[in-house]
């Protein structure tokens, strides 16, 4: 069993290294920013210039393209629930520094949890997404 675990670890690590999770991050960031545009932002607030370019393209077409690419990447983890969990944790970790405030973090986490389902994949069971911004130790 020990040997199998080690091989499993290595296989997962190399899968994660090969995977491009950036489209997933972009898709999720666009989603929560669209939600903020629709519900959360005060229309009279001068805090953001509506003409300033966003780091994430907010057009729906761009988002669905990101989602498709994201789902293709996540599909690689379908048969390894632990590795799927690690992929989601990595997405959370990569974005945690960019999320502004607790509310945005919770929103991102909620969307991230729904991601496998959106892609028609099984969500990993017992997967802890409470990742600290300090990063996690790799095994």
């Amino acid at each position: 069993r020990q040997q199998w675990e080690l091989q499993g670890d290595r296989r997962c690590q190399s899968q994660l290294e090969r995977a491009n999770l950036r489209p997933c991050e972009q898709h999720l960031m666009q989603k929560i920013q669209r939600d903020e545009d629709s519900y959360g932002r005060d229309p009279y607030s001068p805090s953001q210039d509506p003409y300033s370019p966003s780091p994430y393209d907010r057009r729906g077409a761009g988002s669905s393209q990101h989602q498709e690419r994201c789902c293709n990447e996540l599909n690689e983890f379908e048969n390894n629930q632990r590795c799927m969990c690690e992929a989601l944790q990595q997405i959370m970790e990569n974005q945690s520094d960019r999320l502004q405030g607790r509310q945005q973090e919770q929103q991102f986490k909620r969307e991230l949890r729904n991601l496998p389902q959106q892609c028609g994949l099984r969500a990993p069971q017992r997967c802890d997404l409470e990742v600290e911004s300090g990063g996690r130790d790799r095994y």
Partner: antibody
């Protein structure tokens, strides 16, 4: 008030069988995972088996897989543990517990415990 | 030998603060939620902390939980003589498809 009451503990010879029962009350039994946990005399806690709400999924400790069977009767709110080919290593207090595991992004936790029932395997 | 490692014993005076560590690996604590239990002599265990940091109702805020990487910690502040007990951590292990318990820590309040 949540109550879990185990029964069926006994002194049994090595190689023998035993069936433990756990009568649950005070909560909607069919909506919770349930778990058996045991404790050998003077030792720590050891998880034995989990069963999903509808009984469709079961997980076992390696050393009991193939010998023990966890099952449930949601209509009666009763959890069972059928134990076969018992050995001295199976001796201990067996606890019936309610498991708070709900969805993919939550963990196993045991928020209610029975009083425990003693199983002794000895010749 | 338990896969989750806890110190076998720890002692402190009333009013002090103690922490109990629980270390595992990526396949258990690293990926999954941790819970903590208190077992007083000759009684069934009681849930203190679940999902790493959450306290069930009825558990005083003297008890806290945290997790970092593949280790978890239980903190107890304002120690009382009634806290003298065994403390166990637990989590799911994705490779073994099993719940693991730590070996337990006996807390003595001097």
């Amino acid at each position: 008030e949540v109550q879990l009451v185990e029964s069926g503990g006994a002194l049994v010879q090595p190689g023998g069988s035993l069936r433990l029962s756990c009568a649950a009350s005070g909560f909607k039994f069919s909506t919770f995972y349930m778990t058996w946990i045991r404790q050998a005399p003077g030792k720590g806690l050891e998880w034995v088996a989990n069963i999903k709400q509808d009984g469709s999924e079961k997980d076992y400790l390696d050393s009991v897989r193939g010998r023990f069977n966890i099952s449930r009767d949601n209509a009666k709110s009763v959890l069972y543990l059928q134990m076969n080919t018992l050995s001295a290593d199976d001796t201990g207090v067996y606890y019936c517990t309610r498991n708070g595991l709900q969805d993919s992004y939550s963990g196993d936790f045991f928020d209610h415990w029975g009083q425990g029932i003693l199983v002794t395997v000895s010749s | 030998q338990s896969v989750l490692t806890q110190p076998p014993s720890i002692s402190a005076a009333p009013g002090q603060k103690v922490t109990i560590s629980c270390s595992g690996t990526g396949s258990n604590i690293g990926h999954n939620y941790v819970s903590w239990y208190q077992q007083l002599p000759r009684t069934a265990p009681r849930l203190l902390i679940f999902d790493n940091t959450k306290r069930p109702s009825g558990i005083p805020d003297r008890f806290s939980g945290s997790k970092s990487g593949s280790s978890a910690t239980l903190g107890i502040t304002g120690l009382q003589t009634g806290d003298e007990a065994h403390y166990f951590c637990a989590t799911w292990d994705a490779d073994l498809s099993a719940v693991l318990f730590g070996g337990g820590t006996k807390l003595t309040v001097l």
